[in-house]
């Protein structure tokens, strides 16, 4: 009886000891986790901001970027928080009304004032980069380009931000910064291998994407070719980013943006028109528009087609024929002369295409409008859809897209045809390599374009060498240390109990 009582007590005790051990272990885990997490709770983040104005040929856009200050050199930490499109045309159109530039920029600069905390205003850098529209104005007159930029600078200096200047960026820079932007956002510069991918288009390899940028006045192609040696040093760039060397090919085709390409085509076609009516296959049937000859010859892009015409105006009459439009567009590309092993057009060196390409800016806007950005749409299907779209009567088009400004709406047939011609005949993409072109608007909420790359460069946020960093963040490290410490403590306690009183511990538990 006594023996039974004693064994019951022992059983009760051993069970209770186990329960107490378990309970206290859980409490300890919770306590240690709480302490660990509280201890490592991030301090209020020190956020930095940057503003870049993209002064394009057709309009100006303001971009606001933000990033955690302590992670400045990390890859992929900068992201866009705001885009503000300035109402009105590009700054180059303000030559005759420079006094209006201040008002022109007001809305978007005020928006920046609202978005960025007041305490950050004075240390927020503002950069304005002007592209091909201003390059063309400078080509006509350095004085006029300077005057526009001077007024822009004076206007931007009136805001509480840290204004860093307005300048005309080169075509090479435009191409290079676009390439940096998309690869930065796609995580291509990160040397860490990722277990999973949250970025669209991202393959787990670190092969960079090529960049295809289309603006109103120029177009850029930038990529890392397979062959590291280049036949044309003017098109070669060397970068060292995050500890890796990149030999990049880039070229900017001035006058081959969609708007200037259209002016070129009109100037070329009017040369052979028998009267002041231009029957144009690149506009929908039934479309009519009067063009001033003086406007046609205003741009340096039409200089080669300039001639004395017996009329001051002519009328475009749309006939909507994709095939004829395509043929007319091809005449803008001189492929008869190439002083290199391979050229794009107009005697410009182009190495064999390599890898995937991100096509952004107007490449994306136009193709997105035409609903042709899907990865699943083949080049043949795109051509078919373009044929169908261009042949639709203008009245029908206006009804179908009632919310779209007629000026833009009327030009989608030309722009779509031009994009196909440029990619296929200009850059030598094929029906097979078409699938390597990804039409991209945004990557993780940031617009694809040159502005982010420009800011990253000017703020020295892309280090040449890979920053020295621990494999784990501090908080993860502490958390794992606590967890493993607990496991070890518990295992040690149980181990001690087992080894010191094995018979007592296991009694009645079998």
């Amino acid at each position: 009886m006594e023996d039974t009582k004693e064994s019951n007590v022992k059983t009760f005790c051993s069970k209770n000891i186990l329960a107490i051990l378990g309970f206290s272990s859980i409490i300890a885990v919770i306590a240690l986790l709480a302490v660990g997490l509280t201890q490592n709770k991030a301090l209020p983040e020190n956020i930095k901001y940057g503003i870049v104005l993209d002064a394009g040929s057709s309009h100006t856009s303001l971009y606001i970027y933000k990033w955690p200050a302590e992670k400045e050199n990390d890859t992929g930490v900068v992201h866009q928080v705001e885009e503000c499109r300035v109402k009105g045309p590009g700054i180059s159109k303000y030559v005759q009304k420079v006094n209006e530039i201040g008002i022109y920029l007001t809305d978007c600069m005020e928006r920046a004032r609202e978005v960025i905390p007041r305490s950050q205003h004075q240390e927020t850098p503002v950069y304005l980069g002007a592209t091909a529209g201003m390059r063309l104005l400078r080509m006509e007159s350095e004085e006029l380009a300077d005057r526009v930029l001077d007024v822009v600078e004076r206007s931007l200096s009136n805001y509480p931000f840290d204004f860093q200047g307005a300048r005309i960026i080169t075509g090479q820079e435009e191409g290079a910064y676009g390439w940096i932007t998309i690869n930065y956002l796609l995580g291509k510069f990160s040397q860490k291998t990722r277990w999973f991918s949250i970025v669209p288009y991202e393959t787990n390899n670190q092969e960079t994407f090529g960049a295809l940028d289309l603006g109103g006045a120029s177009t850029q192609i930038t990529f890392v070719p397979q062959n590291q040696t280049t036949e044309s040093p003017d098109n070669a760039l060397q970068f060292r980013l995050y500890g890796k060397d990149y030999n990049v090919y880039t070229h900017s085709f001035l006058c081959y943006g969609k708007d200037q390409a259209l002016w070129q085509k009109l100037a070329k076609d009017i040369q052979v028109a028998s009267n002041e009516i231009l029957r144009d296959p690149c506009f929908h049937p039934g479309y009519k528009k009067v063009v001033n000859v003086s406007d046609l010859y205003k741009t340096p892009c039409t200089k080669r087609f300039e001639m004395t015409l017996p009329f001051q105006q002519f009328e475009i009459q749309g006939i909507g024929n994709y095939q004829q439009c395509h043929q007319s567009v091809l005449e803008l590309f001189n492929t008869s002369y190439c002083p290199y092993s391979q050229c794009a057009f107009n005697g410009i060196f182009l190495p064999p295409l390599q890898g995937d390409f991100g096509a952004f800016s107007a490449f994306y806007f136009v193709m997105n409008f035409l609903n042709l950005t899907s990865e699943k749409v083949s080049q043949e299907k795109v051509t078919e859809m373009m044929k169908k779209f261009c042949s639709q009567p203008w009245e029908e088009i206006k009804t179908s897209y009632a919310g779209v400004k007629e000026k833009y709406l009327s030009e989608y047939c030309f722009s779509g045809t031009y994009i196909l011609s440029l990619l296929l005949q200009g850059y030598h993409f094929t029906a097979d390599s078409w699938e390597h072109i990804h039409f991209i608007g945004k990557i993780q909420g940031s617009d694809a374009g040159w502005t982010l790359g420009y800011m990253l460069n000017l703020t020295n946020m892309i280090p040449a060498e890979q920053p020295l960093s621990t494999p784990l963040s501090h908080s993860t490290y502490v958390f794992l240390m606590v967890l493993f410490s607990l496991v070890l403590v518990i295992v040690a306690i149980i181990g001690l109990l087992i080894f010191h009183k094995p018979s007592y511990f296991w009694k009645d538990m079998v």
Partner: antibody
Framework: QVQLVQSGAEVKKPGASVKVSCKAS????????MHWVRQAPGQRLEWMGY????????TFSQKFKGRATITVDTSASTAYMELSSLRSEDTAVYYC?????????WGQGTLVTVSS | DIVMTQSPDSLAVSLGERATINCRAS??????????MYWYQQKPGQPPKLLIY???NQGSGVPDRFSGSGSGTDFTLTISSLQAEDVAVYYC?????????FGGGTKVEIK
């Protein structure tokens, strides 16, 4: 830095043609127009015409229309000015100058002597 | 064509003294609020060197003693304190419209 280097001096007979070259470096060749200006001995500077290198379009002073031709080779970043049907009054130093409206950079000049 | 008339044809100034050259255009060379007027310096055997652009802006590397003024049709180049190295021929030019035209030149010498 921007540099414009011109070809050497030429001696030509009346009625012949001369072609002067101007090699540019230090900037994107197609971003700026190239002008040609000449200066006869002891005379004022005389603007002849210009070319838009990005597409080869050109404009001339009425005086030189039909007799002067300006061309470019963009792959070599070089502009050329050819003057035909030379006469003794074409003896001059021929300059290339980069610019839209501001001639900030000039070649060193090429002396063309027209003599029978 | 816009005719550019320079005066005087030649000018002798003592070292350290002010030299003033005038240029008159046959019509206004202003457009869009900019004066398309330029001044060049040319020394024997050398190409012209841009001194002043847009009527009053100094070219890069041009000493402060050179200044330009004027608008419309009347323009002036001033050398505030003549130095020995300033001996040269000075030309005005308009690029408002084609054909771009030059003045006849002013020869500056030391008195």
């Amino acid at each position: 830095q921007v540099q414009l280097v011109q070809s050497g001096a030429e001696v030509k007979k009346p009625g012949a043609s001369v072609k002067v070259s101007c090699k540019a470096s230090g900037y994107t060749f197609t971003d700026y127009n190239m002008h040609w200006v000449r200066q006869a001995p002891g005379q004022r500077l005389e603007w002849m015409g210009y070319i838009v290198p990005l597409n080869g379009g050109s404009t001339f002073s009425q005086k030189f229309k039909g007799r002067a031709t300006i061309t470019v080779d963009t792959s070599a970043s070089t502009a050329y000015m050819e003057l035909s049907s030379l006469r003794s009054e074409d003896t001059a130093v021929y300059y290339c100058a980069r610019g839209g409206t501001r001639f900030a950079y000039w070649g060193q000049g090429t002396l063309v002597t027209v003599s029978s | 064509d816009i005719v550019m008339t320079q005066s005087p044809d030649s000018l002798a100034v003592s070292l350290g003294e002010r030299a003033t050259i005038n240029c008159r255009a046959s019509e206004s060379v202003d457009n869009f609020g900019v004066s398309f007027m330029y001044w060049y310096q040319q020394k024997p055997g050398q190409p012209p060197k841009l001194l002043i652009y847009g009527a009053s802006n100094q070219g890069s590397g041009v000493p402060d003693r050179f200044s330009g003024s004027g608008s419309g049709t009347d323009f002036t180049l001033t050398i505030s304190s003549l130095q020995a190295e300033d001996v040269a021929v000075y030309y005005c030019q308009q690029t408002k419209e084609v054909p771009y035209t030059f003045g006849g030149g002013t020869k500056v010498e030391i008195k």
